[in-house]
């Protein structure tokens, strides 16, 4: 008789196979700024605005930031985005030893994204792998979904776009 909690045989269940996102695929399969994904745009955050304090810098040494502007802007993001990104950084290193997560765009103050981009409020990041091997980006997108980003889009040959719900809507949903 087998007692509770006992496992028959010594074989462990193989890890679930991760299916890469296809180019131009997004998950969940709804528009980014809808309730089932990252939710509505709440307005641009400027350095001078009161809401700027909602953004927190990410100094995770396991993440490489492109920081083309040399301002540190790409490191700024909401706490929810930071948590998901840090989780993804671990997944990337586990998936590809010697490779790190790389952020090409985070919070943007330059205004070169689309009109109501979540980059303007620190809720979106564009990511690649540190080796910039584009063959990896489909799987990187899947890892981002698994890391808990609220919307992931294999947007470009050159990057994967990830975004999160606002702190307010996320807190209301979890009751925290």
């Amino acid at each position: 008789i087998i007692g509770p909690g006992r496992v028959v045989g010594s074989r462990r269940r193989p890890p679930r196979k991760l299916v890469p996102l296809a180019y131009k695929q997004f998950s969940p399969n709804v528009p980014e700024k809808t309730l089932g994904a990252s939710g509505r745009y709440e307005g641009k955050i400027a350095r001078s605005s009161e809401r700027f304090k909602e953004l927190t810098p990410n100094y995770n040494p396991d993440i490489i930031f492109k920081d083309e502007e040399n301002t540190g802007a790409d490191r700024l993001m909401t706490q929810r985005c930071k948590d998901r990104l840090n989780s993804l950084a671990i997944s990337v290193m586990n998936q590809w030893p010697g490779v790190k997560l790389r952020v090409t765009e985070g919070w943007d103050e330059d205004g070169h994204h689309s009109e109501e981009s979540l980059h303007y409020e620190g809720r979106a990041v564009d990511i690649t792998t540190s080796d910039r091997d584009r063959n990896k980006y489909g799987l990187l997108a899947r890892l981002a979904v698994e890391a808990g980003f609220d919307w992931v889009y294999y947007e470009s040959k050159a990057h994967v776009h990830c975004s999160v719900k606002s702190e307010h809507s996320a807190a209301a949903k979890t009751g925290g």
Epitope: K66, E68, E69, N70, T71, T104, D108, D110, G111, H112, T128, R132, R134, N135, S156, K157, A158, H159
Partner: antibody, heavy 123, light 105 residues
Framework: QVQLQESGPGLVKPSQTLSLTCTVS??????????WSWIRQHPGKGLEWIGS???????YYNPSLKSRVTISVDTSKNQFSLKLSSVTAADTAVYYC???????????????WGRGTLVTVSS | SYELTQPPSVSVSPGQTASITCSGE??????VSWYQQKPGQSPVLVIY???KRPSGIPERFSGSNSGNTATLTISGTQAMDEADYYC????????FGGGTKLTVL
């Protein structure tokens, strides 16, 4: 609309430094997303990218020319410049300044070009 | 260093379709642009992002890119399309193809 205009000497002596300036009018060189670039074309030949600079000062150079090239930006004058040192006759070419845009992660394309200026290297 | 290869010349009759190819290792993973240059003039961007047309460029210009080959297609070619065409791709170092002379017979 944005326009680019190259300026500088048309004749440079061998071993000297070639210096060109590109003036941007009708728009700010500080605009994010643009890579201000230099491209040259030897007489009767194809195009060769020399290098690009972002308004923040980050520079990107053709590996084959890197040791001799310096590109700088002067945001106050809305200009960017090229310096190519130790020139030889092989550097004789039409030099274009151009505005690069990024399709992705350094996937540049050049949507605006100056008229070009012929620089001859000769003693 | 990365190289892009184009045929030196392509000929086409007026009204016909001209195809100019550009090949490079894993080119499909990169974004390709195409430029038209007429004698004595600066290059003009005709296709970017593999298949997008800048404003002012006629609809007869189209592009595609997959595998190791990108293609510029000019449908209903006109005499005014006679020019040199250059493909270009980048990866922190912009690279141009050698150019293709398009002759409209």
């Amino acid at each position: 609309q944005v326009q680019l205009q190259e300026s500088g000497p048309g004749l440079v002596k061998p071993s000297q430094t070639l210096s060109l300036t590109c003036t941007v009018s009708g728009g700010s060189i500080n605009s994010g997303g643009f890579y201000w670039s230099w491209i040259r074309q030897h007489p009767g030949k194809g195009l060769e990218w020399i290098g690009s600079i972002y308004y923040s000062g980050n520079t990107y150079y053709n590996p084959s020319l890197k040791s001799r090239v310096t590109i700088s930006v002067d945001t106050s004058k809305n200009q960017f410049s090229l310096k190519l040192s130790s020139v030889t006759a092989a550097d004789t070419a039409v030099y274009y300044c151009a505005r690069g845009q990024d399709s992705g992660d350094y996937d540049w394309y050049f949507d605006l070009w100056g008229r070009g200026t012929l620089v001859t290297v000769s003693s | 260093s990365y190289e892009l290869t184009q045929p030196p010349s392509v000929s086409v009759s007026p009204g016909q379709t001209a195809s100019i190819t550009c090949s490079g290792e894993k080119l499909g993973y990169k974004y390709v642009s195409w430029y038209q240059q007429k004698p004595g003039q600066s290059p003009v961007l005709v296709i970017y992002h593999d298949n997008k047309r800048p404003s002012g460029i006629p609809e007869r210009f189209s592009g595609s890119n997959s595998g190791n080959t990108a293609t510029l297609t000019i449908s209903g070619t006109q005499a005014m399309d006679e020019a040199d065409y250059y493909c270009q791709a980048g990866d922190s170092s912009a690279v141009f193809g050698g150019g293709t002379k398009l002759t409209v017979l």
